[in-house]
């Protein structure tokens, strides 16, 4: 019996199409596949950012694969050919590994890259990113932001920079059509007469950095002699009611009475007839049904009742 062998794929490479971290891994079939014409060859691909403990593993019949990477670090990948057992009248046969790496040659020292990058998607409508200049860079240093997400033909540069002392320290993004629930890639690079500036790469999903507007139209309604219903409305904008969680803070006669997490736009409070003043505020956050993370809104304006019998009136701010 001659041992069945198969070659690894040819021309294995990582291609950067300029999408700021979304890379193509591609290869060609192995040499000498003639013996296995009736066979569907598969490929096992493993890849990771250098420094990561775990490999991502894909088994595919295709000659390419696409995924997102952190371009602040290098990328390593390896691939081998798999002949299923049906092709070999026995056990699966694997080729040796073909390996490749990719990294962007870093310019400048790490301290020159932007510091404290912070992006917030306000009310699921307006994306704003801000940063601080690198440590020790001169005032002639300027930073430029580029972004890409699936659906754009190519990476775009920010057209509305936020400036301080003539330097770009942030970006107001235009309307970003169909940009949520997918990776959003950003590169901030820089230029200086004095010294090279290190680029920084960031990846996130917009729905996970939403800061909603606070709830509005806070009201009180007396339900019974010992119960008051607090109500509010979802803030204006594109976020549906089912996506909100709320936190409510109620103060009775200058003492914090209740802090509670609430899933809908009402809260029933048990009170005593001695209550002289009742105030409450509410804030909102996108819940786990609509995102993996989120940012609490600012607190709403305070709504108070004070001074007269609560049972006699419904209060509307």
């Amino acid at each position: 019996d001659t041992e069945i062998k198969v070659n690894p794929p040819q021309d294995f490479e990582i291609v950067d199409p300029g999408y700021l971290g979304y890379l193509y891994l591609q290869w060609q079939p192995p040499l000498s596949l003639d013996h296995f014409k009736e066979c569907t060859v598969e490929y096992e691909l493993k890849y990771r950012n250098i420094g990561s403990e775990t490999w991502k593993t894909i088994i595919t019949k295709n000659l390419h694969y696409k995924d997102g990477f952190d371009l602040n670090k290098g990328i390593e990948a390896k691939i081998h050919t798999l002949l299923p057992w049906q092709c070999t009248n026995g056990s699966e046969v694997q080729s040796s590994w073909a390996e490749t790496t990719y990294w962007i040659s870093p310019q400048g020292i790490p301290e020159t890259k932007v510091q404290d990058m912070d992006c917030v998607y306000y009310n699921w409508q307006y994306l704003l990113c801000s940063w601080k200049p690198g440590i020790g860079v001169l005032l002639d240093t300027n930073y430029n932001l580029f972004y890409w997400y699936e659906g754009l033909d190519h990476a775009l540069q920010c057209v509305d920079y936020i400036k301080a002392d003539g330097q770009n320290i942030g970006c107001r993004f235009p309307y970003l059509e169909a940009s949520d629930y997918k990776d959003f890639y950003i590169c901030v690079n820089g230029s200086s007469e004095n010294k090279p500036i290190r680029s920084s790469y960031f990846t996130f999903q917009l729905q996970n950095i939403v800061k909603p507007l606070p709830p509005v139209y806070l009201t009180f309604t007396r339900e019974s002699s010992c119960e008051i219903k607090l109500k509010w409305s979802i803030p204006l904008g594109p976020i549906p009611a089912r996506c909100f969680d709320y936190e409510i803070e109620i103060r009775e006669d200058d003492t914090t009475l209740v802090t509670a997490t609430v899933e809908n736009e009402t809260y029933t409070l048990k009170t005593t007839n001695e209550t002289r003043q009742l105030c409450f505020v509410v804030r909102s956050k996108v819940n786990i049904y609509c995102s993996d993370d989120g940012i609490w809104s600012e607190w709403s304006d305070k709504q108070c009742w004070e001074g007269e019998d609560l049972s006699k009136k419904t209060l509307l701010r």
Epitope: A241, R242, A260, T261, E263, N264, I288, Y289, D292
Partner: antibody, heavy 115, light 107 residues
């Protein structure tokens, strides 16, 4: 009042599929998530997934992907769960539940997989 | 996945005793922890939501506390109708997970 009425017990053979139902009443069907939870005899509870009848969006526990298919019929306010390629490990009580904004559970559907 | 560890597995008590049931999360879940009671051949019933918030119609002897990773369900003066299984459940992230349960039984 809110009710989740589940279909009756099922006795099926290994390798087959079963579709159980959960009929909702007493609240706005299209505005609440309906979850499914599995409980094997004498054991704990496992979350399977949810469906939002308003737009048909679905989220599954990775563990149950491929095993479970959730669907909703707005006209009858009913959610369905299809379990496929059944084995004895799928023998359990399956609950539908509204776990957000309200908290209501169906009475459970007992599935027995046996040859 | 977030793992919820309940202790003790079984608690044998006499009516009138006060008891505490523990639930520990494998990572911080803020206050996104809920307690359920389940009696034999019944569906679970929500007792406490968001770690400490009481539920309308649930007796006031049930209370909850904790935040982050450590949570407690307290029953002040157990009544005979309280015997059964108690489960904690987290809603901090997907998949939703439940503890294995604490069985409250008659001594």
């Amino acid at each position: 009042q809110v009710q989740l009425q589940q279909s009756g017990p099922e006795l099926v053979k290994p390798g087959t599929s079963v579709k159980m139902s959960c009929k909702a009443s007493g609240y706005t069907f299209t505005s609440n998530y309906i979850h499914w939870v599995k409980q094997r005899p004498g054991q704990g509870l496992e979350w399977i997934g949810w469906i939002y009848p308003g737009d048909g969006s679905i989220k599954y526990n990775e563990k149950f992907k491929g095993k479970t298919t959730l669907t909703a019929d707005k006209s009858s306010s009913t959610v369905y769960m299809l379990l496929s390629s059944l084995t004895s490990e799928d023998s359990a009580i399956y609950f539908c539940a509204v776990l957000r904004r309200l908290d209501y559970w169906g009475q459970g559907t007992t599935l027995t997989v046996s040859s | 996945d977030i793992v919820l560890t309940q202790s003790p597995a079984t608690l044998s008590v006499t009516p009138g005793d006060s008891v505490s049931l523990s639930c520990r999360a494998s990572q911080s879940i803020s206050n996104n922890l809920h307690w359920y009671q389940q009696k034999s051949h019944e569906s679970p019933r929500l007792l406490i939501k968001y770690a400490s918030q009481s539920i309308s119609g649930i007796p006031s002897r049930f209370s909850g506390s904790g935040s982050g990773t450590d949570f407690t369900l307290s029953i002040n003066s157990v009544e005979t109708e309280d015997f059964g299984m108690y489960f904690c459940q987290q809603s901090n992230s997907w998949p939703l997970t439940f503890g294995a349960g604490t069985k409250l039984e008659l001594k």
